[in-house]
């Protein structure tokens, strides 16, 4: 069998909404993966889990099943979302991402992704992990890759 | 507003021990870490720990286990910093601070410890 | 540990001119990064938070940039009152550390 290669794209999208009185960060974070199969057979995308992480705490997990196949020599774009909440020991990024001095409210995430293929009943897993630039601060939605190659020299309001 | 009120100089002999407190005001305290810097003399900073009040977590540097411990008194919003065994490295101004996203906000006064006999 | 390389260790300026102050990393800390100044017999004092925005109170002549390992702080027009040390610092991961300071003298 010749290799299924899964490329981490990056951020979708990030929407965000808050809970004043809890000073909790929701979080909704869309993700792009290129999985590409470069065998002579299909084969199947049988799960994508998903995790988020902020400052080495898991803000988010996700999990999607029985997804899509891929035709030989096929490749094909996923977009899978992270629900996030950054919250409780971590409340004191909710002064940051509503702070109303500064124009971009970029926090790094963690983005961790496994993939499971499976191809005449052999299944197969493949894990990426990217640290990402995320505006906390308001609806964003990127450009393919942008997110990890954010220029964050943002010029003050 | 915010502020860290930290206590008074301490001349103490080489051995002893010194605690000294942060008190925090302004703000809920459980939200922010405390962090805690020493400065010796005409030298610059190093960072001790941390202490978040939100859960009791406390985070310290290797080259202070063993010299810093860090506590807490939630009904008075004080952190304190606790250093033994004193030698004349010690000797040095210590400060607390308050942790925000990429950097510390809010700076106490610091708190001035002479180790001599 | 990541050890924050900064320069200059001092300078020395006229009022009205620029400086930039620089910090390098030994790996990418991602914009988690202060600039403090610190004046002679006080405590340091908050300029930039992660890499570039401007803490409260702040004048905006001074400013933050960079990302990934390479940091820098510039004071446009240079006031008497900026006189003082200048410290960056990671936020990345424990521990953080400072860099040794940047001492800004007056000329």
């Known amino acids: 069998p010749r290799s299924i290669d899964v490329k981490y794209i990056g951020v979708k999208s990030a929407y965000v909404s808050y809970d004043v009185q809890k000073r909790t960060i929701y979080l909704n974070i869309t993700n792009t993966l290129n999985i590409t199969n470069n065998n002579y057979y299909s084969v199947e995308v049988e799960n994508i889990t998903a995790q988020v992480q902020f400052a080495k705490t898991v803000i988010g997990k996700a999990r999607l099943n029985n997804i899509t196949h891929i035709g030989p020599l096929d490749m094909k774009q996923i977009d899978y979302t992270v629900p996030t909440v950054i919250a409780e020991e971590m409340s004191y990024m909710y002064d940051f991402c509503t702070l109303i001095s500064i124009k971009v409210h970029n926090i790094v995430l963690m983005m961790q992704v496994t993939v499971t293929t499976t191809y005449f009943g052999h299944s197969e897993q493949i894990s990426q992990e990217r640290y990402q630039y995320v505006d906390c601060g308001r609806n964003t939605t990127y450009q393919l890759g942008q997110s990890e190659y954010l220029n964050v020299l943002q010029p003050q309001q | 507003q915010v502020q860290l009120q930290q206590s008074g100089a301490e001349l103490v002999k080489p051995g002893a021990s010194v605690k000294m407190s942060c008190k925090a005001s302004?703000?809920?305290?459980?939200?922010?870490?405390i962090e805690w810097m020493k400065q010796s003399h005409g030298k610059g900073l190093e960072w001790i720990g941390n202490f978040h009040p939100y859960n009791d977590d406390t985070k310290y540097n290797e080259k202070f286990k063993g010299k810093a411990t860090l506590t807490v008194d939630k009904s008075s919003s004080t952190v304190y910093l606790d250093l033994s065994r004193l030698t004349s490295d010690d000797s040095a101004v210590y400060y607390c601070?308050?942790?925000?996203?990429?950097?510390?906000?809010?700076w106490g006064q610091g708190t001035s410890v002479t180790v001599s006999s | 540990d990541i050890q924050m390389t900064q320069s200059p260790a001092s300078l020395s300026v006229s009022v009205g001119e620029t400086v930039t102050i620089t910090c390098r990393a030994s790996?990418?800390?991602?914009?988690?990064l202060g600039w403090y100044q610190q004046k002679q017999g006080e405590s340091p004092q908050l300029l930039v938070f992660?890499?570039?925005n401007l803490a409260d109170g702040v004048p905006s002549r001074f400013s933050g940039s960079g990302s990934g390992t390479q940091y820098s702080l510039k004071i446009n027009s240079l006031q008497s009152e900026d006189f003082g040390t200048y410290y960056c610092q990671h936020l990345w991961s424990i521990p953080w550390t400072f860099g040794g300071g940047t001492r800004l003298e007056i000329k």
């Open positions: 302004g703000y809920t305290f459980t939200t922010f870490p």
């Open positions: 790996e990418n800390i991602y914009s988690s």
């Open positions: 992660a890499a570039t």
């Open positions: 601070a308050r942790y925000f996203y990429g950097g510390m906000d809010y």
